[in-house]
Structure formats: structure tokens, C-alpha cells
């Protein structure tokens, strides 16, 4: 339905985001916000998989909200924007804005961690450990396990974070979690526990006495 | 309020000419495509014409090709029909409309009636 | 001969919902969205459903619009006197370079 038939030069993409956040808890208001370079006629959301758009909204300006009520985890999916002007012509619109995916849900998927190079080290080396989500922009928290505040944070524009772990204190077990950077806050389940050890120490546990 | 007022109706003989115009206002008319469309009596519509991209995209459709000519003067917020060539199936109530994707405004028409 | 295809009339009784349907191709309803307008006897054209689902202020929401495929369809429920009139899809169509509508449905509100 939506094809531009003229110079793409002439129908540039907007720009689509979402308020509070692109990951939400359910029953929240989500506001999705496109935003064109130019000032526009009209403004069309459209969810992926559906022809028709979801949403229109009529503005004459560069700037469209669309709002989702109380979303549910079915309103989740993958989103863009299009804009068009009043004289582009007949079913003429920009190009499609970036996708923005709109994950709603109460607990995020449980990230990976792993050690780089590996789990065993020589003694009085740096180790780093890969905390690994599938959505980017999150904040990261490594913990040791037996400690109850997390060793590091990191805010990653990643779908990932490597924390680093400096010489002798570095065998023990750990493991992390993230979460959304802002409020409303949606937290991940922690990861599985991953055991660091010095060479030839074989499975001593260093947790004991920290 | 957005309106939209034919006129240059009439009756003319097959063969003939006629200027049709249609007055806008209530909006920015040189922001707008435009198109006219016709209603042979007691028939279904039919689009006749539509102009684009202030005036650089111009579409008619096949039965008027050749004869008929849109135009438009965003100075004066009017568009234009300019017929030539006149035939009976071109009789007709001819009807201007705002066409920024659907003709979202209409006029209430003007009458062409092509007969000797 | 209309490029889009509609049954030439319908008809129900008050409170009831009707439906109506416009078949065309590729070229038009199925790469461009559907327009809906509604023509009361003796006026101009207004414009009541368009891209496919979508309602102007103002028109109530007992009009719906769908498209499936190369087809699209006009739905009244809760259908009233004042829905007598005739009802016209229209479509942009890429080969022809126009704009076409359907032969247009009048519809009667029976009874």
C-alpha cells in the first residue's frame, strides 16, 4: 500500500521512538513518537505483518504521537512510520522509518555469561566476563555469588557488557543479570552461574570467606 | 471550513469548448492535489483529471486524454478544467474535490450538458 | 464497464448489518489502499471510510471498512433509514495512472 513511486532523495525517512522506553511492563502507556524532517500531512504507524496501518494521525506538522493504552505483550512486535504531504500524489510516502521493536513484558530473557579467554586462569590474571542479552541499550550488573551489592554496572549501548576482573581477587562464582536503563524498570532473570578458578586450583570454590 | 465552488457549466454543442473553475478556500490551496470527477446522469463517478506535486504531476484519465486539461492558479485558489472536443458522454455533473490521497472534500458539482 | 466490481445494489432492514463488497486486481485495491465514499440522493460525494479501515470524524463507527487481498468491503451495522444512499469504492491503479471507482451499490433500507 505504501510504495513511494518518485526519487527517494524527495521522500526522506522519519525517525520513530518510543516514551517511556522500547521495553515496557504491561499495563503501561506508551506514547510512539515519529518524527519527520520535514512538516507533514499525515502520519501512518504500521506494525509489521499488517497492510493496513495501525494507526493515522492528520497533523501538519513534523511531529505524530501515537498512543498505546495499557499495552499487552500481543501489542509487542515491530513498528515504523511513514509520512506524506498533501500533493505527493496518489498512495506516495516517505521511505520507512527505522524499526523500532516494542517488547512488552514482566521478567526479560536470562542473558549468558561467559569467560574471555575461559574460566580457568593463571594465577594474578585479568579476566573479562561477557554478560549477553538480545536486546541493546540495557544496564548490566555483575555479582559475585555470596555478595549482596553488585561488583560492577555498566550501561551498554550493546546487547551485551564485558566486565572486567582485576588479578588475585578473580576466582569465585558469578553471575548477572540487566535490566531497562530507565523507569519503568523490567528486569532480565539472572544468569546461570559461571565459576572462575585458577589454574591447577581445580574446583576449589573462592566464594568461602568473601 | 473548507469549500469547494464549481462553475462554468452549461450547454454546449458536441465539438464544443468549456472552462470549467472550481473556487477553494478554507485551506492552503497550493498545498493541495486536486482532481475533478464527473456523474453522467443517473450513472456511477467517474475521475477525470488530477494534478500533483503543485502542478508537476498531472494524471487523466484515458477518455479525456488529449481533450481535457487541468490547470490550476494557487495566486487565485482556483483550479481549472479546460474541455475541448466535446462529446454526449461527456454530459455530466463534474464535481471538484480535494485529493491530498482520497478526496477527502467535495464541491457540490456544476452541470455540462453536451447536446445539439 | 467499472475497473472495480460492485454488486449493483443491497438492501436490510433497520438494525440490521449489511456489507458491502469491491473486487478488482493487483494494479489497484491490492498494492493501494481503498477509499469508501457515500452519495445521498440529490448531494455531492462524502467521504466515509478511507486507507482501507479508517473513519473521518464524524462518520460513526457502525461503518468499518476491511481489505483483504484484491478485494475490499464495505460493513453498516445497526443500519438506519438515513444510510439509503449510494455507495462507491475507489482505488488508485498503478497501470491505468488513475484513480477508479466501483460502479457504485445503492442501498435501501427496507421497511
Known amino acids: 500500500d505504501f510504495t513511494p513511486t518518485a526519487p527517494l532523495a524527495s521522500y526522506p525517512q522519519p525517525w520513530l521512538g518510543a516514551h517511556p522506553a522500547a521495553v515496557v511492563t504491561p499495563g503501561i502507556n506508551v506514547t510512539l513518537t515519529c518524527r519527520a524532517p520535514q512538516s507533514a500531512w499525515r502520519f501512518a504507524l504500521f506494525k509489521s505483518g499488517l497492510v493496513t496501518p495501525l494507526l493515522l494521525r492528520d497533523v501538519s506538522v513534523e511531529l505524530a504521537e501515537f498512543f498505546l493504552e495499557e499495552v499487552t505483550p500481543a501489542q509487542g512486535g515491530s513498528y515504523h512510520c511513514r509520512y506524506r504531504k498533501t500533493d505527493w500524489g496518489p498512495g506516495v510516502w516517505s521511505q520507512p522509518s527505522n524499526v523500532l521493536e516494542l517488547l512488552v513484558t514482566d521478567q526479560l530473557p536470562r542473558p549468558s555469561l561467559v569467560a574471555l579467554p575461559g574460566p580457568v586462569v593463571a594465577p594474578g590474571a585479568n579476566v573479562s566476563l561477557r554478560c549477553a542479552g538480545r536486546i541493546p541499550g540495557m544496564s548490566f550488573a555483575l555479582y559475585r555469588v555470596g555478595v549482596a551489592t553488585p561488583l560492577q554496572y555498566i550501561d551498554s549501548v550493546q546487547p551485551w557488557a564485558d566486565f572486567l576482573l582485576i588479578g588475585t581477587h578473580t576466582p569465585g562464582t558469578y553471575c548477572c543479570y540487566y535490566h531497562t536503563p530507565s523507569a519503568p524498570y523490567v528486569l532480565s532473570q539472572r544468569s546461570q552461574p559461571l565459576v572462575i578458578s585458577f589454574e591447577g586450583s581445580g574446583s576449589l570454590d573462592y566464594t568461602q570467606g568473601n | 471550513e473548507v469549500q469547494l465552488l464549481e462553475s462554468g457549466g452549461g450547454l454546449v454543442q458536441p465539438g464544443g469548448s468549456l472552462r470549467l473553475s472550481c473556487a477553494a478556500s478554507?485551506?492552503?490551496?497550493?498545498?493541495?492535489?486536486m482532481s475533478w470527477v464527473r456523474q453522467a446522469p443517473g450513472k456511477g463517478l467517474e475521475w477525470v483529471s488530477g494534478i500533483y506535486h503543485g502542478g508537476g504531476n498531472i494524471y487523466y484519465a484515458d477518455s479525456v486524454k488529449g481533450r481535457f486539461t487541468i490547470s490550476r492558479d494557487n495566486s487565485k485558489n482556483t483550479l481549472y478544467l479546460q474541455m475541448n472536443s466535446l462529446r454526449a458522454e461527456d454530459t455530466a455533473v463534474y464535481y471538484c474535490?480535494?485529493?491530498?490521497?482520497?478526496?477527502?472534500?467535495w464541491g457540490q458539482g456544476t452541470l455540462v450538458t453536451v447536446s445539439s | 464497464q467499472s475497473v472495480l466490481t460492485q454488486p449493483p445494489s443491497a438492501s436490510g432492514t433497520p438494525g440490521q448489518r449489511v456489507t458491502i463488497s469491491c473486487s478488482g486486481s493487483s494494479s489497484n485495491i491490492g498494492n493501494n489502499s481503498v477509499t469508501w465514499y457515500q452519495q445521498l440522493p440529490g448531494t455531492a460525494p462524502k467521504l466515509l471510510i478511507y486507507y482501507n479501515s479508517h473513519r473521518p470524524s464524524g462518520v460513526p463507527d457502525r461503518f468499518s471498512g476491511s481489505k483483504p487481498g484484491t478485494s475490499a468491503s464495505l460493513a453498516i451495522s445497526g443500519l438506519r433509514s438515513e444510510d439509503e444512499a449510494d455507495y462507491y469504492c475507489?482505488?488508485?491503479?498503478?497501470?491505468?495512472?488513475?484513480?477508479?471507482f466501483g460502479g457504485g451499490t445503492k442501498l435501501t433500507v427496507l421497511g
Open positions: 475507489g482505488a488508485w491503479d498503478s497501470s491505468l495512472n488513475g484513480y477508479v
Open positions: 478554507g485551506f492552503t490551496f497550493s498545498d493541495y492535489a
Open positions: 474535490a480535494r485529493a491530498p490521497d482520497e478526496f477527502d472534500y
